[in-house]
C-alpha cells in the first residue's frame, strides 16, 4: 500500500476541527501579477508581501504594486501601500531585509526616466513606518547590508560606481568608480574589483582587487590580473590570469588579502571555470571545470589553509550553460553532502558523502521501492535525487532537496530508483538518518516543508489543476493525514513558512480565477492545536548519528568525533516549540587513516584507506607556494582532515620546510600590492 495508508497509521484526533479553527484566509485586493514575500526578523511574525501588476499600454508599460504587512505569521494582512506613497516597487531588487533582528527593510522604487537618481523606502521598525530617500545614483544591484552593522549599506550604480551609506541609506557617498563586483567581508571590510580601460567585460582577467577596511577612507590594492574573486568561510579566493597565456589559477588568502598563496589546483582555460561549492571556517569544496563543453568537472577539498587540495569526486555535474549543479549541503547532519555525477553513458547519478568529501557512494535503495527501467539489475540499484539540474531541465520536480539544521537527520527530496536519474514522474523520499537510509514518503511530485523542528511535515501535491487539500505528518513522513483547507480550490503557487523551521504556521499561496478576474489569496494554517502539548523528556530518545555498526567501538565516528542527539520519538505528537535547541553530546574518537586526507602528490586507490604516491610525482621533490615563497613538503602522504577532532591512535608525520625561494608563478606577492587614501 502507499505510504501513510497502512492500518498501523494512527490518526491525529479531531484534527479537522482543530485545523478549521486555525485556518485563516486572506484575499488580496489585487489583480494577479507577481507576488513576493519576505520575513522580517526572526520569530517576530512579521511578513511583507509585495504584489506587482504590469499593464501594457500602447507606448509603455504601466506598473502598479501594493505592499501588505502581517504581524501574526500571515493570518491577517494590512495594506500599507500608503506608507510608500503608492509607489511602484521594482521587484527585480526584491525586498532587502536587514540581518539578524535589525528590523530593517529597504524597498527600491521605480523612477521615471530622466531622473537624477533612484528612490528607496527605508524602515528600521519592522516595516511599521517607511522613510522615502532619493538617491544620488541609479542602483544596479540590491542594497547590501554589512553582516556586522546593519546601518552600513553598499550598492553598485548603473554607472559602475561603488556607493556606501553609514546611516542606513540616509546619506550616500561614492567611494570608487569603475567597480565590477563588490562584497562585504568580515569586520565591515569591503572587497571589490575595478577596471582600468573599457569595462568589466573588456578587462576581465586584467581587473584589480581592492580592499577598504574603513568604508572608503583608504584603500589597498590586494591583487592584479584578476578574473574574479569570491569569499567562503574565512577564505578569500581570487582567480588570476597567468603571465604567459590565457589560463588562470586560484589564489587564496586567509588574512583579508594581505598575503596570498597559490592553491594547488589545476589551472583553467578561457572557457572553463572554478566554483566554490561550499565553504566553512575549516575547509572548502572547490569545483574545477573540465576542458571543453563537457558539463562536468572535478570536486577538490582543501586543507585548513585552503592551499593543498585533494581530489574528492570525478565527473561532477556542473553545466557551463546555465551554471547548474546539484551540489547540496545536507544541513541536518554534519559532514553530509549530496551531488550528481555524469556517468560515461551520459546519464546522471546521485552520490553522497558522509565525511565531508572523503568518500562518495551511491544512495541506498529505499526498502519500499522497486528499481525502474534505468536499472541493469532489478534487485540492485540506488536512489537518485532530483535537484537543480532536474529543475533546470523542466522535469516534474517542484522543489529541491530540503533539510534543516534543527530537524536532525531529516532529508526530503524528489527522486527515482534505478541506475540513474529518470525522466519519469518522480516520487518524494525521506531519510531520517541524514541520508544513510531512505523511504518513499509520497507518491508523485509534491511541495513540502518542515515545521516545529521536524515535529510536523507538510506537503501539497504538485498539480496543474486547482487544489484544496494539504497533507501533514507528525511522525517524520510515515503516516499522512489530509485536510481540506477550503471549499473552493485555488491555483497553487507556493508554500511559505518562516525560515528556520521553528514555526507551526504554514501559508498556502495561490490565486482564484473567475470569469472576469483573478485574485491572490493566502491560507495560513496554524498547527499548534494538533501538537497540543509541549514535548517532555519522555518524548525524546537518544540517537547516535552516523551509526552503521553498533558492535564497533568506533561506530558513529565522523571527522574524529561522534555525536549523540536527543531526538523526538516518531510516536510522540507534541510541540518542540520555538525555543527548541538541538541537544547533542559529542565524544572524541581515536585517529585512524580515515581521519586523514591524502597529501599533495598522493591519492587513495579505490576501496583503500592508504594514501599512495601519484606515479607522475614519484621521486620528485614536492614543492608548493605558500605566501609567495616556495615550500618543500616532507610527507608520508597524509594530512588531517580540516575540522577533524580525533586524538591518539594513528599519527602520520607531516613536515613543511621553507625553501626561502620566490614563487615565480605567484602574481599576488606582497611587493605587487599598494595602498592609497582618499
Amino acid at each position: 500500500s502507499a505510504p501513510g495508508e497502512d492500518e498501523e497509521c494512527g490518526r491525529v484526533r479531531d484534527f479537522v476541527a482543530k485545523l478549521a479553527n486555525n485556518t485563516h484566509q486572506h484575499v488580496f485586493d489585487d489583480l494577479r501579477g507577481s507576488v513576493s514575500l519576505s520575513w522580517v526578523g526572526d520569530s517576530t511574525g512579521v511578513i511583507l508581501v509585495l504584489t506587482t501588476f504590469h499593464v501594457p499600454l500602447v507606448i509603455m508599460t504601466f506598473g502598479q504594486s501594493k505592499l501588505y504587512r502581517s504581524e501574526d505569521y500571515g493570518k491577517n494582512f494590512k495594506d500599507i501601500t500608503d506608507l510608500i506613497n503608492n509607489t511602484f516597487i521594482r521587484t527585480e531588487f526584491g525586498m532587502a531585509i536587514g540581518p539578524e533582528n535589525s528590523g530593517k527593510v529597504v524597498l527600491t522604487a521605480e523612477v521615471s526616466g530622466g531622473s537624477r537618481g533612484g528612490r528607496i523606502f527605508r524602515s528600521s521598525d519592522f516595516a511599521k513606518n517607511f522613510v522615502q530617500t532619493d538617491l544620488p545614483f541609479h542602483p544596479l544591484t540590491q542594497m547590501m547590508y554589512s553582516p556586522q552593522n546593519s546601518d552600513y549599506l553598499l550598492a553598485l550604480s548603473t554607472e559602475n560606481g561603488l556607493w556606501v551609506s553609514k546611516n542606513f541609506g540616509g546619506k550616500w557617498e561614492e567611494i570608487h568608480k569603475a567597480v565590477c563586483l563588490a562584497k562585504w567581508g568580515s569586520d565591515n571590510t569591503i572587497f571589490f574589483t575595478t577596471y582600468a580601460n573599457g569595462s568589466c567585460k573588456a578587462d576581465l582577467g586584467a581587473l584589480e582587487l581592492w580592499r577598504t577596511s574603513d568604508l572608503g577612507k583608504s584603500f589597498k590594492t590586494i591583487g592584479v590580473k584578476i578574473y574574479s574573486f569570491g569569499l567562503g568561510g574565512r577564505f578569500l579566493f581570487a582567480s588570476v590570469m597567468a603571465d604567459k597565456d590565457t589560463t588562470r589559477r586560484i589564489h587564496v588568502s586567509t588574512d583579508q588579502g594581505d598575503t596570498w598563496s597559490m592553491a594547488q589546483l589545476p589551472s583553467v582555460g578561457q572557457e572553463q571555470f572554478y566554483s566554490i561549492l561550499a565553504a566553512n571556517d575549516d575547509m572548502v569544496f572547490m569545483h574545477v571545470d573540465e576542458p571543453g563543453d563537457t558539463g562536468f568537472g572535478t570536486i577538490f577539498t582543501s586543507d585548513d589553509r585552503g592551499i593543498v587540495y585533494s581530489k574528492s569526486l570525478d565527473r561532477h555535474l556542473y553545466t557551463t550553460t546555465g551554471g547548474e549543479t546539484d551540489f547540496t549541503n545536507v544541513t541536518s547532519l554534519r559532514g553530509v553532502y549530496i551531488t550528481s555525477v555524469l556517468s560515461e553513458d551520459n546519464s546522471i547519478q546521485t552520490m553522497i558523502t558522509f565525511d565531508q568529501g572523503g568518500r562518495w557512494t551511491h544512495l541506498r535503495k529505499p526498502e519500499n521501492s522497486e528499481c525502474d527501467a534505468t536499472a541493469k539489475n532489478k534487485n540492485e540499484c540506488s536512489l537518485h535525487i532530483h535537484a537543480s539540474y532536474s529543475i533546470s531541465q523542466k522535469l516534474n520536480v517542484p522543489m529541491a532537496p530540503l533539510s534543516e539544521p534543527n530537524a536532525v537527520g531529516i532529508v526530503i527530496a524528489h527522486g527515482s530508483v534505478g541506475d540513474a536519474i529518470s525522466v519519469m514522474v518522480p516520487d518524494v523520499y525521506i531519510s531520517d538518518d541524514g541520508g544513510y537510509s531512505w523511504t518513499k514518503m509520497l507518491e508523485g511530485p509534491h511541495y513540502y516543508t518542515i515545521l516545529d523542528s521536524g515535529g510536523i511535515i507538510v506537503a501539497i501535491e504538485h498539480s496543474s489543476r486547482p487544489i484544496n487539500v494539504i497533507k501533514f505528518s507528525t511522525d517524520e513522513g510515515q503516516c499522512w493525514q489530509t485536510y481540506t483547507f477550503t471549499r473552493d480550490p485555488i491555483y497553487f503557487t507556493g508554500l511559505a513558512s518562516e525560515p528556520g523551521a521553528r514555526s507551526m504556521n504554514i501559508s498556502i499561496w495561490g490565486f482564484t480565477e473567475s470569469f472576469l478576474t483573478s485574485q491572490w489569496v493566502s491560507y495560513t494554517i496554524d498547527f499548534k492545536d494538533i501538537l497540543e502539548r509541549n514535548c517532555e523528556e519522555k518524548d525524546y530518545t537518544i540517537w547516535l548519528a552516523h551509526s552503521t555498526d553498533p558492535e564497533d567501538y568506533e561506530d558513529g565516528c565522523i571527522l574524529g568525533y561522534k555525536e549523540q542527539f536527543l531526538r523526538l520519538r516518531k510516536s510522540s505528537v507534541c510541540q518542540n516549540g520555538r525555543d527548541y535547541v538541538v541537544t547533542k553530546q559529542p565524544s572524541i574518537c581515536l585517529c585512524s587513516l580515515e581521519d586523514f586526507l591524502c597529501d599533495f602528490g598522493y591519492y587513495r586507490p579505490e576501496n583503500d584507506s592508504k594514501c599512495v604516491e601519484q606515479p607522475e610525482l614519484k621521486g620528485h621533490d614536492l614543492e608548493f607556494c605558500l605566501y609567495g615563497r616556495e615550500e618543500h613538503l616532507t610527507t608520508n602522504g597524509y594530512r588531517k582532515i580540516p575540522g577533524d577532532k580525533c586524538q591518539g591512535g594513528v599519527n602520520p608525520v607531516r613536515e613543511v620546510k621553507d625553501l626561502k625561494k620566490k614563487c615565480t608563478s605567484n602574481f599576488l606577492s606582497p611587493e605587487k600590492q599598494n595602498s592609497k587614501s582618499n
Partner: antibody, heavy 128, light 107 residues
Framework: QVQLVQSGAEVKKPGASVKVSCKAS????????MSWVRQAPGQGLEWMGI????????SYAQKFQGRVTMTRDTSTSTVYMELSSLRSEDTAVYYC?????????????????????WGQGTTVTVSS | EIVMTQSPATLSVSPGERATLSCRAS??????LAWYQQKPGQAPRLLIY???TRATGIPARFSGSGSGTEFTLTISSLQSEDFAVYYC?????????FGGGTKVEIK
C-alpha cells in the same frame, strides 16, 4: 539485419488478458531498451511503457499502471507485454520498438535518439 | 504529461513541392524530439531524432529543425513514396507522448 518480430494477432473477450511477444535479432539484445506503443484503429500512436532488458526493470505510463506487465527473456532475446482486464477500447495494433536512449535523464550534451527499429505490429481485438 | 500538437491535420501537396509540418509541445522538450513516418498497414519508421538529425538511410530531402516547444519537419521536394502520416514524439519527460499526426496527401 536488425529486426523485431512480434507474435500473431489475438482475439480476446473483455476482462481477459493478452500477452504479446517481440523477438529481437541482429543486435545485442541487452544493450537497448524496448518501448511498447499501441495504435487504436484510425487513431494516433500511444506510448505504453519501457523495459530494460538488463535486469528487466520497467516504467509504465500512468494510464496503464496496474494493468500492464512487461517482461523479458534474455536467453531468447524476447520481450513480452501483457495487458490484463481488457476492454473494447484496448482494441489496437501493439508495437514493440527499440529505444536506444532509455529513460535516464541525460547530461547537457546529449539528445534523444528515437525509436529506431519497430516490430511489424500485433493486432489485438477485444470483443464479446 | 507533455501534450504534442501537430498542424495541419491534413496537408495536400503536389509531387515535387515542398511540405512543412509543424509540431508544438506544451512545454519545452529541449531537442528530445523524433519524427516518424507511417504508411497504411505498416509500422512507423524513424526519420529524424534529436530534433534535427536524420536517421540512417533517410533521404536528404527530409530535414528537422526547432528546439524547445516549436519544431518543423520539412520535405523539400515530395516524392510519391512520401505520402503518408507523420508523427512527432517527445522524450523529454515521461511518459513519452506523440502528436496526433499530419496526413500528407496528394493534391
Amino acid at each position: 539485419q536488425v529486426q523485431l518480430v512480434q507474435s500473431g494477432a489475438e482475439v480476446k473477450k473483455p476482462g481477459a488478458s493478452v500477452k504479446v511477444s517481440c523477438k529481437a535479432s541482429g543486435y545485442t539484445f541487452t544493450k537497448y531498451y524496448m518501448s511498447w506503443v499501441r495504435q487504436a484503429p484510425g487513431q494516433g500512436l500511444e506510448w505504453m511503457g519501457i523495459i530494460n532488458p538488463i535486469g528487466g526493470s520497467t516504467s509504465y505510463a500512468q494510464k496503464f499502471q496496474g494493468r500492464v506487465t512487461m517482461t523479458r527473456d534474455t536467453s531468447t532475446s524476447t520481450v513480452y507485454m501483457e495487458l490484463s482486464s481488457l476492454r473494447s477500447e484496448d482494441t489496437a495494433v501493439y508495437y514493440c520498438a527499440r529505444d536506444p536512449s532509455g529513460i535516464a535523464l541525460a547530461g547537457p550534451a546529449s539528445r534523444y535518439y528515437g525509436m529506431d527499429v519497430w516490430g511489424q505490429g500485433t493486432t489485438v481485438t477485444v470483443s464479446s | 504529461e507533455i501534450v504534442m500538437t501537430q498542424s495541419p491535420a491534413t496537408l495536400s501537396v503536389s509531387p515535387g513541392e515542398r511540405a512543412t509540418l509543424s509540431c508544438r509541445a506544451s512545454q519545452s522538450v529541449s531537442s528530445n524530439l523524433a519524427w516518424y513516418q507511417q504508411k497504411p498497414g505498416q509500422a512507423p519508421r524513424l526519420l529524424i531524432y534529436g530534433a534535427s538529425t536524420r536517421a540512417t538511410g533517410i533521404p536528404a530531402r527530409f530535414s528537422g529543425s526547432g528546439s524547445g516547444t516549436e519544431f518543423t519537419l520539412t520535405i523539400s521536394s515530395l516524392q510519391s513514396e512520401d505520402f503518408a502520416v507523420y508523427y512527432c514524439q517527445q522524450a523529454r519527460l515521461g511518459p513519452w507522448t506523440f502528436g496526433g499526426g499530419t496526413k500528407v496527401e496528394i493534391k
